[in-house]
Interface confidence: medium
């Protein structure tokens, strides 16, 4: 025997008490599948949440976060955006560890400080969690006759002579 409630479409509920009539969902509620005996209450996007998609009789509201906050999980929580000197992890905003930095507001990851000694440069200014180190000039920059503004020669494609 077919369940008469299976004929109730999404956006309605099957009212047991009224000979299984398909009644429309009450205000601020929805049913996304047919045959439901009650309607789910709509999610309300309040406070730091803002409405990304309005609730309809057949689908729930969807929220995102107000500027300065970001979603966690399926946007079940809004967390303050990370400041410079932090990065977003599964556990939330974490301060960059020693030797790394993030200079971006709200986004980005902690990146290692530049290693000045790799190209023989000295450290002019120590790095922080928010700023990279400032390296001194390279030895080549300091050699006589060197010009730091000489443009590189343009590359030529083989087999082509200049016009």
């Amino acid at each position: 025997l077919q369940d008469p409630c299976s004929n109730c479409p999404a956006g309605t509920f099957c009212d047991n008490n009224r000979n299984q009539i398909c009644s429309p969902c009450p205000p601020n509620s929805f049913s996304s599948a047919g045959g439901q005996r009650t309607c789910d209450i709509c999610r309300q996007c309040k406070g730091v949440f803002r409405t990304r998609k309005e609730c309809s009789s057949t689908s729930n509201a969807e929220c995102d976060c107000t500027p300065g906050f970001h979603c966690l999980g399926q946007c079940t929580r809004c967390e303050k955006d990370c400041r410079p000197g932090q990065e977003l992890t599964k556990q939330g905003c974490k301060t960059c560890s020693l030797g790394t930095f993030n200079d971006q507001n709200g986004t980005g990851v902690c990146r290692p400080w530049t290693n000045c000694s790799l190209d023989g440069r000295s450290v002019l200014k120590t790095g922080t969690t928010e700023k990279d180190v400032v390296c001194g000039p390279s030895p080549a920059d300091l050699s006589p006759g060197a010009s730091s503004v000489t443009p590189p020669a343009p590359a030529r494609e083989p087999g082509h002579s200049p016009q």
Partner: antibody, heavy 117, light 107 residues
């Protein structure tokens, strides 16, 4: 015939987490909601929270930080977890089916929970 | 949260009496009100939903009325099996809240 049956530990120590299960027979959790209600000794009924057919939840704002309601549709079970228990959580805990325009048409018999060391 | 206040908290009446129980909401709840009966053994049953709609199987001596903030449950002729505590419950706004209950006894 629709039946709801609560099962719980009976006695729980303060600061521990309470875990109660509501087993539903003769009714589908994908069509109906389930609401948890408790009643301290000699006092009135207090709504704790609801899980909807779609799986979303709403909680009593005063208890929200301590409550988790979840369900397993295939087992027809709804579970209530409440953390950081105190003596004030000693009560009879009921689950009830939510239907129609949000009335509780079938109730479980209740399970007694005592919080004591 | 919406506060629900019931009066009286207890009452004693004779068999066959007409009994009325009042329920007041701290703000307007339209007709979004249900009534429940809790027997001395703890069993809870739905009596009336949406202010005045009788749940299936509930005797016709029970009736409900009201709108907005003030509601009434009436038992037209008290029977021995009506000894119980009666609760109103609003579902206008989450969290859904119950009244404090009215304990009904037989004189």
């Amino acid at each position: 015939q629709v039946q709801l049956q609560e099962s719980g530990p009976g006695l729980v120590k303060p600061s521990e987490t309470l875990s109660i299960t509501c087993t539903v027979s003769g009714s589908s959790l994908t069509s109906y909601g389930v609401h948890w209600v408790r009643q301290p000794p000699g006092k009135g009924l207090e709504g704790l929270g609801v899980i909807w057919p779609g799986g979303s939840t709403n909680y009593n704002s005063a208890l929200m930080s301590r409550l988790t309601i979840s369900k397993d549709n295939s087992k027809s079970q709804v579970s209530l977890k409440m953390s950081s228990l105190t003596a004030a959580d000693t009560a009879m805990y009921y689950c009830a089916r939510v239907t129609g325009t949000w009335y509780f048409d079938v109730w479980g018999q209740g399970t007694t929970v005592t919080v004591s060391s | 949260d919406i506060q629900m206040t019931q009066s009286p908290s207890s009452l004693s009446a004779s068999l066959g009496d007409r009994v009325t129980i009042s329920c007041s909401a701290s703000q307007g709840i339209s007709n979004y009100l249900n009534w429940y009966q809790q027997k001395p053994d703890g069993t809870v049953k739905l009596l009336i939903y949406y202010t005045s709609t009788l749940h299936s199987g509930v005797p016709s001596r029970f009736s409900g009325s009201g709108s907005g903030t003030d509601f009434t449950l009436t038992i037209s002729s008290l029977q021995p099996e009506d000894v119980a505590t009666y609760y109103c419950q609003q579902y206008s706004k989450l969290p859904w809240t119950f009244g404090g209950g009215t304990k009904l006894e037989i004189k």
